[in-house]
């Protein structure tokens, strides 16, 4: 009689996680009598996947009715495949006995599971940086299989080239993770900018996954200061204005100093937003020119986003005409007491 053969025609089968897999197995003879069992793996640690005689295998069904007379097809159907199901499956013929005796194994079918990558998560730097500095963004995605994957970085739609990508583990595995770090040079116009990490994988059918991060979380645009004075209608008053321009984020503390001594402090409130996302703000003082002493210096000092203060000074200019308007007895503070101390606009 011809020796029984166990035939597993497919060397490998690949399915997407969540789908079903069919593992084919036929035998060439009905003799000797005995059951077929399916195992994942070989050796002493192999797992019983299906045994017709006994056991509960809720995810496994036979393709044909194995109890039918003369049945030689012992293919199985495994539902709801997960990455943990990956491995080599063996169809094994046993000879009936007490206990049953293993007789012959098929060559094995390797089941590989295609699994979608998780949505990419992009994280930026923990501290803000100023324009012209380089910041790093990291993109991570997990749980995909097979290992082949493509990751691209974009800034405002333009592809970036300065990045480094790792896929782990290096060898074969049930599933893989990708981690990529991109380096981005900041510019003053980046408050509205966005970086995008795009992941393409065979399971995504040409529709890549994207993760984004806003550069507004990573950038600090320091302000430029300008201090100037303008005459007011009242001949003995001038308006000294501190113009704070092009800063981001909004957090700003402004202090006026008169000859180095603090005269008032205010927090930026009503800001003007520029098209590029930065902000402008102005603060002013009404100064009584009659109360001046020679060489009064007014300093506008700005502390932006917790950074060391920057300042701009202005020497008060009083014209001869203004001096003439003052009576000899006039005295008091330089800052007009009845005028509002500051303002914004």
């Amino acid at each position: 009689e011809e020796e029984l053969q166990v035939i597993q025609p497919e060397k490998s089968v690949s399915v997407t996680a969540g789908e079903s897999a069919t593992l084919n197995c036929t035998v060439t003879s009905l003799i000797p009598v005995g059951p077929i069992q399916w195992f994942r793996g070989a050796g002493p640690g192999r797992e019983l996947i299906y045994n017709l005689k006994e056991g509960h295998f809720p995810r496994v069904t036979t393709v044909l009715d194995p109890t039918k007379r003369n049945n030689m097809d012992f293919s199985i159907h495994i539902s709801n495949i997960t990455p943990a199901d990956a491995g080599t499956y063996y169809c094994v013929k046993f000879r009936k006995g007490s206990p049953d005796v293993e007789l012959k194994s098929g060559a094995g079918t390797e089941l590989s599971v295609r699994a979608k990558p998780s949505a990419p998560v992009v994280s930026g730097p923990t501290a803000r940086a100023t324009p012209e500095h380089t910041v790093s963004f990291t993109c991570e995605s997990h749980g995909f299989s097979p290992r082949d994957i493509t990751l691209k970085w974009f800034k405002n739609g333009n592809e970036l080239s300065d990045f480094q990508t790792n896929v782990d583990p290096a060898g074969k595995s049930v599933s893989y993770s990708i981690r990529s770090t991109a380096r981005v040079v900041l510019t003053r116009r980046d408050v509205h900018s966005q970086v995008i990490c795009e992941v393409a994988h065979v399971t995504l059918q040409g529709d890549p996954l994207r993760g984004t991060a806003n550069l507004s979380e990573a950038i600090r645009v320091p302000p430029t200061l300008e201090v100037f004075q303008r005459p007011m209608r009242a001949e003995n008053q001038v308006n000294v204005t501190c113009q704070v321009r092009k800063f981001y984020p909004q957090r700003l503390l402004l202090t006026w100093l008169e000859n180095g001594n603090v005269s008032q402090t205010e927090t930026a409130s009503t800001l003007t937003e520029n098209k590029d996302g930065t902000y402008n703000w102005r603060s002013w003082l009404l100064v009584n020119t009659c109360a001046h002493r020679d060489g009064v210096v007014l300093t506008c000092q700005v502390e932006h986003d917790g950074q060391p203060a920057v300042s701009k000074s202005h020497a008060l200019e009083v014209s001869a005409h203004q001096k003439e308007q003052c009576s000899d007895t006039t005295s008091g503070p330089v800052l007009a007491p009845t005028a509002p101390l500051g303002g914004s606009g």
């Epitope: 070989a42 194994s105 060898g171």
Partner: antibody, heavy 122, light 112 residues
């Protein structure tokens, strides 16, 4: 090309726990058994135990109460822990990959680490 | 446990000449599927062991064909058709049928 690299302390005090890690590079943990084998100075080889890719462990009964083998598939590593060591545990410790193609038997320990010498001494 | 016994303990050889090592197991290593789960390893001086033969007679990848394994049940033999200088070291048999896996005591092959 699959490579195995053992790592861990070269000196362990008596009664303490010996901990070794084997890093698998260039290949998969899947479908293989991952073994620890030791060789005392000037002596033969002793199988300590192995772990399959599904986490099932098998130990040498002569060591079973003291040995634990674990697997970290995400790191492509497997580890050996042996408690209450004595001078008799001084040996070269090898990690190795064991193949299984058919039946309940095994089909050769085909990849070995270079071995790490562990001395048990106070 | 299955006990593995190797002979001889030491084997002086002449390069170019054949050599033979015997390994006996305390119980049959022939499984019901027809495979005999016995391996042969060579450990060269200062190196890790290297797989030569598995399932009694199958040569491992990259192993020269001067090495051959035979036997069934409890009696196994490793033959080297023409010994080369690089074959010096300790040869071990190992049963791989059941745990605990067990090794023979080793046969030291050295050049005469």
């Amino acid at each position: 090309q699959v490579q195995l690299q053992e790592s861990g302390p070269g000196l362990v005090r008596p009664s303490e726990t010996l901990s070794l890690t084997c890093t698998v590079s260039g290949g998969s943990i899947r479908n293989y058994y991952w073994s620890w084998i030791r060789q005392p100075p000037g002596k033969g080889l002793e199988w300590m135990g192995f772990i399959y890719d599904n986490g099932r462990t098998f130990y040498n009964p002569s060591l079973k109460s003291r040995v634990t083998i674990s697997l970290d598939m995400s790191m492509n590593q497997f580890s050996l822990k042996m408690t209450s060591v004595t001078a008799a545990d001084t040996a070269v410790y090898y990690c190795a990959r064991v193949r299984a193609y058919s039946g309940i038997g095994l089909d050769g320990t085909d990849v070995w680490g270079q071995g790490t010498t562990v001395t048990v001494s106070s | 446990d299955i006990v593995m016994t190797q002979s001889p303990l030491s084997l002086p050889v002449t390069p170019g000449e054949p050599a033979s090592i015997s390994c006996k197991s305390s119980q049959s290593l022939l499984y019901s599927n027809g495979y005999a789960y016995l391996d042969w390893y060579l450990q060269r001086p200062g190196q890790s062991p290297q797989l030569l033969i598995y399932q009694g007679s199958n040569r491992a990848s990259g192993v020269p064909d001067r090495f051959s394994g035979s036997g069934s049940g409890t009696d196994f033999t490793l033959k080297i058709s023409r010994v080369e200088a690089e074959d010096v070291g300790v040869f071990y048999c190992m049963q791989a049928l059941q745990t605990p896996l067990t090794f023979g005591g080793g046969t030291k092959v050295e050049i005469k």
